[in-house]
Interface confidence: low
């Protein structure tokens, strides 16, 4: 009779994490007598997966009834597969011996590859806010996937980004992998409502990629534009001066009125109006008693926005002339509209 052969017909088996793997093995003869054992890996460090003779293997079931005398099918099923189960599995025939059974013949091995879904991508932005025209970096991380092949894309408001670098670790063989990507995004003034999306596509996701998002409202700072104007007289000796603070984000803003360099009043932006682009407008007014001043008054509206250096705009109030509507006169430390950052 021909010598027994152990046949593992599948060179490799691919299984999704959480599913059951079937590892096939058949023998060509009933002789010699002895048990079958399954191992992961070869050599002295191999791991016992199943022993027909003894032991408790809760995740393993046999495909056929191994107690039947004429059984030559030693295939097994391993349930609830995880990436840690990946490896090469060997079906090994032992010959009955005393005191121990002796290894007789091994199959060629079946490589079990586990398809594990990537974790939901986590997108994180810079620690500090940045102003429009700054380039900021966003990172995206996803873990625990297998096989290694994966596609990552970045989008800003549906438009695909091209300036990013992606690494998949580890470089060599592993039971599962992680991806890390850094994208550079140039902020624009309209980005308060914008979103950055990291999209991960993997064979396990069946064409339905995972997405992680970051709202640029957490990242952007739009500096305010200031305009100081003098309103018509409210009373014979009173002039109303307003400071319009426009198109800023976030809302955190403190305004200080200075009269000839001396602090007159400080207030925090509270009842703001929101523009359609997500930025805010706010107006503060100062009632100036002209009769209390002998000389011309320099009124300065000084704004500290989101902890940044103060910007200010000034208005010269002529007290010598009869108080009436005057144009906006701007002698300021920071002049011009503050709508586009230039760093």
């Amino acid at each position: 009779e021909e010598e027994l052969q152990v046949i593992q017909p599948d060179k490799s088996v691919l299984v999704a994490a959480g599913e059951t793997a079937t590892l096939r093995c058949t023998a060509t003869s009933l002789i010699p007598v002895g048990p079958i054992q399954w191992f992961r890996g070869a050599g002295p460090g191999r791991e016992l997966i199943y022993n027909q003779k003894e032991g408790h293997f809760p995740r393993v079931t046999t495909v056929s009834d191994l107690t039947k005398r004429n059984n030559m099918d030693f295939s097994i099923r391993i349930g609830n597969i995880t990436p840690a189960d990946a490896g090469t599995y060997y079906c090994v025939k032992f010959r009955k011996g005393s005191p121990d059974d002796v290894e007789f013949k091994s199959g060629a091995g079946t490589e079990l590859s586990v398809r594990a879904k990537p974790s939901a991508p986590v997108v994180s932005g810079p620690a500090a806010r940045a102003t429009p025209q700054h380039t900021v970096s966003f990172t995206c991380e996803s873990h625990g996937f297998s096989p290694r092949d994966i596609t990552l894309k970045w989008f800003k408001n549906g438009n695909e980004l091209s300036d990013f670098q992606t690494n998949v670790d580890p470089v060599g063989e592993s039971v599962s992998y992680s991806i890390h990507s850094t994208a550079k995004v140039v902020l624009t003034r309209e980005d308060v409502h914008s979103q950055v999306i990291c999209e991960v596509a993997h064979v396990t996701l069946q064409g339905d990629p995972l997405r992680g998002t970051a709202n640029l409202s957490e990242t952007i700072r739009v500096p305010p534009t200031l305009e100081v104007t003098q309103q018509p007289v409210r009373a014979e000796n009173q002039v109303n001066v307003t400071c319009q603070v426009r198109k800023f984000y976030p809302q955190r803003l403190q305004l200080t009125w200075l009269e000839n360099g001396n602090v007159s009043r400080t207030e925090t932006a509270s009842t703001v109006t929101e523009n359609k682009d997500g930025t805010y407008n706010w107006m503060s007014w100062l009632l100036v008693n002209v009769s209390a001043h002998r000389d011309d008054v320099k009124l300065t509206c000084q704004v500290e926005h989101d902890g940044q250096p103060a910007v200010s705009k000034s208005h010269d109030l002529k007290v010598s002339a009869h108080p009436k509507e005057q144009g906006s006169n701007t002698a300021a430390e920071n002049t011009g509209s503050n709508e586009r950052n230039i760093y």
Epitope: R189, P223, T335, N338, E339, R340, N341
Partner: antibody, heavy 131, light 103 residues
Amino acid sequence: VTLDESGGGLQTPGGALSLVCKASGFTFSSYNMGWVRQAPDKGLEFVAGIYTGSDAGLSTTYGAAVQGRATISRDNGQSTVRLQLNNLGAEDTGIYFCTKSAGGCSDYNCDAYIADSIDAWGHGTEVIVSS
Amino acid sequence: AVTQPASVSANPGETVKITCSGSSSYYGWYRQKSPGSAPVTLIYDNDKRPSGIPSRFSGSKSGSTNTLTITGVQADDEAVYYCGNEDNSYVGIFGAGTTLTVL
């Protein structure tokens, strides 16, 4: 608003030219200024831009074709902007237009740049580089 | 880079749209009647019209595409239309120009 360019004419290859734009009709120091040129039978090409703001991280910018050869400067007192272009070649032949932007920059921010915000053009001065 | 069509044509009275695509947030539109003549600004900062420019010229932006719309095209509108913007280094860029032919 008027922008009057001068300094064009026949130039020698390898030589240098200096174009001056005299501006009037607006508060010159508050606006970004630039130079745009047009080679014969070609489109518009950005040459250089200069911005307001004393310490802006952005003070001058240059087109790729003139980078390293051009210098743009402004004199707010005289309301002039000057373009110096060295090592002239035949590809520098064309009409050079002075441009005014719709706004300017502070030390921290801009409300206008150059090519997206031009609101006034000069009539142009012709430069011919030939031996 | 800035991309715009090489040419467009329209009958008098029609509406014509000229597109310009790039990566910038802001665009300007400039008209040149003949090569070498001074361009005229039609639109700056996407949608702002200088004084003296008729309201039939308008600009709009959607995504990375900017559009110049001319309603009620006239024979006098025949010209080359350029769009301009800035790259991320603030260097100006102009499109190659779109020739408008009024049929």
